[in-house]
Interface confidence: low
């Protein structure tokens, strides 16, 4: 079914490489999608010996792997960079690693901020 305008969703935005890439470091990102495409949020991070290092957060375009996920949960066992995606405004604020094979769940919830909206 078509629609007259691009859908919007809002996600938490973060870029650890903001200086080099000349972007904002953090805030809110308003996602804009193509006609009939779903919109998601994502988070990516590294885990060095239990220390969480946030890499990026933001909008993620239509991806079946993200459909109907209310929580941002990474399921890969031990990747170099963890990745999760989800549907729902700001659903990428908190993110979790929960390997499909089982094991402990690790949830990271950054301190809330009052970010500025990225346009």
């Amino acid at each position: 079914s078509g629609r007259g305008e691009a859908e919007t969703r809002e996600c938490i935005y973060y870029n650890a490489n903001w200086e080099l890439e000349r972007t904002n470091q953090s805030g809110l990102e308003r996602c804009e999608g193509e006609q009939d495409k779903r919109l998601h949020c994502y988070a990516s991070w590294r885990n060095s010996s239990g220390t969480i290092e946030l890499v990026k957060k933001g909008c993620w375009l239509d991806d079946f792997n993200c459909y109907d996920r209310q929580e941002c949960v990474a399921t890969e066992e031990n990747p170099q960079v963890y990745f999760c995606c989800c549907e729902g405004n700001f659903c990428n604020e908190r993110f979790t690693h929960l390997p499909e094979a089982g094991g402990p769940e690790v949830t990271y919830e950054p301190p809330p901020t009052a970010p500025t909206l990225l346009t």
Epitope: L39, D68, Q70, G88, R94, P112
Partner: antibody, heavy 116, light 107 residues
Framework: QMQLVQSGGGLVKPGGSLRLSCAPS????????MSWIRQAPGKGLEWISN????????YYADSVKGRFTISRDNAKNSLYLQMNSLRAEDTAVYYC?????????WGQGTTITVSS | DIQMTQSPSSLSASVGDRVTITCRAS??????LAWYQQKPGKAPKLLIY???TLQSGVPSRFSGSGSGTDFTLTISSLQPEDFATYYC?????????FGGGTKVEIK
């Protein structure tokens, strides 16, 4: 223009049933979580149910659990609330609303009166 | 379940006044909080989400702050159209819950 248009309210006897409908327009319905909220006369807002965008995840308030059923038909662009075993305390204005982290679009409200 | 407590339940103020409404959650909800305005006979209107982010089209005199358990909605300079009832809502976990409301009346 994004909006939600509700239908299905009315007067019903205790123990009776009623189905509310909510028709979205101006946005892609299947991308959004939807909720029902009610407001008893002179009282505050009470969230009663939420359904995820594809209908997989459904939640209810304890006050309606087992009696009310939320559902959606993304092909027909419709949200429903089936209300069974209605009680006097279910008398309220019922609203459908879009979203979860902030309900940004609301229906106009429909009045349900449960009385003998 | 998370309970939301709003205070005061009502207040009287004049046009131009600074108005502050508080909302307390029974347990930590990070910044998963929304504020709504409702006028008699009308559906609620979203003002603020994520505790402090202004909804598109809402005047900048409205602001939200707080995280964890204590939250504040501030109207910096009350306008005639702001006389209404205001509700907070936690969206951290189900069942979602609203505060009892704060009615802002004309002094």
């Amino acid at each position: 223009q994004m909006q939600l248009v509700q239908s299905g309210g009315g007067l019903v006897k205790p123990g009776g049933s009623l189905r509310l409908s909510c028709a979205p327009s101006g946005f892609t319905f299947r991308d959004y979580h939807m909720s029902w909220i009610r407001q008893a006369p002179g009282k505050g807002l009470e969230w009663i149910s939420n359904i995820s965008n594809s209908g997989t995840n459904i939640y209810y308030a304890d006050s309606v659990k087992g009696r009310f059923t939320i559902s959606r038909d993304n092909a027909k662009n419709s949200l429903y609330l089936q209300m069974n075993s209605l009680r006097a305390e279910d008398t309220a204005v019922y609203y459908c609303a879009r979203g979860h982290y902030g309900m940004d679009i609301w229906g106009q409200g429909t009045t349900i009166t449960v009385s003998s | 379940d998370i309970q939301m407590t709003q205070s005061p339940s009502s207040l009287s103020a004049s046009v131009g006044d600074r108005v502050t409404i508080t909302c307390r959650a029974s347990q930590g909800i990070a910044n998963y909080l929304a504020w709504y305005q409702q006028k008699p006979g009308k559906a609620p209107k979203l003002l603020i989400y994520a505790a402090s982010t202004l909804q598109s089209g809402v005047p900048s005199r409205f602001s939200g702050s707080g995280s964890g358990t204590d939250f504040t909605l501030t109207i910096s300079s009350l306008q005639p159209e702001d006389f209404a009832t205001y509700y907070c809502q936690q969206v951290k976990s189900y069942p979602l819950s609203f505060g009892g409301g704060t009615k802002v009346e004309i002094k």
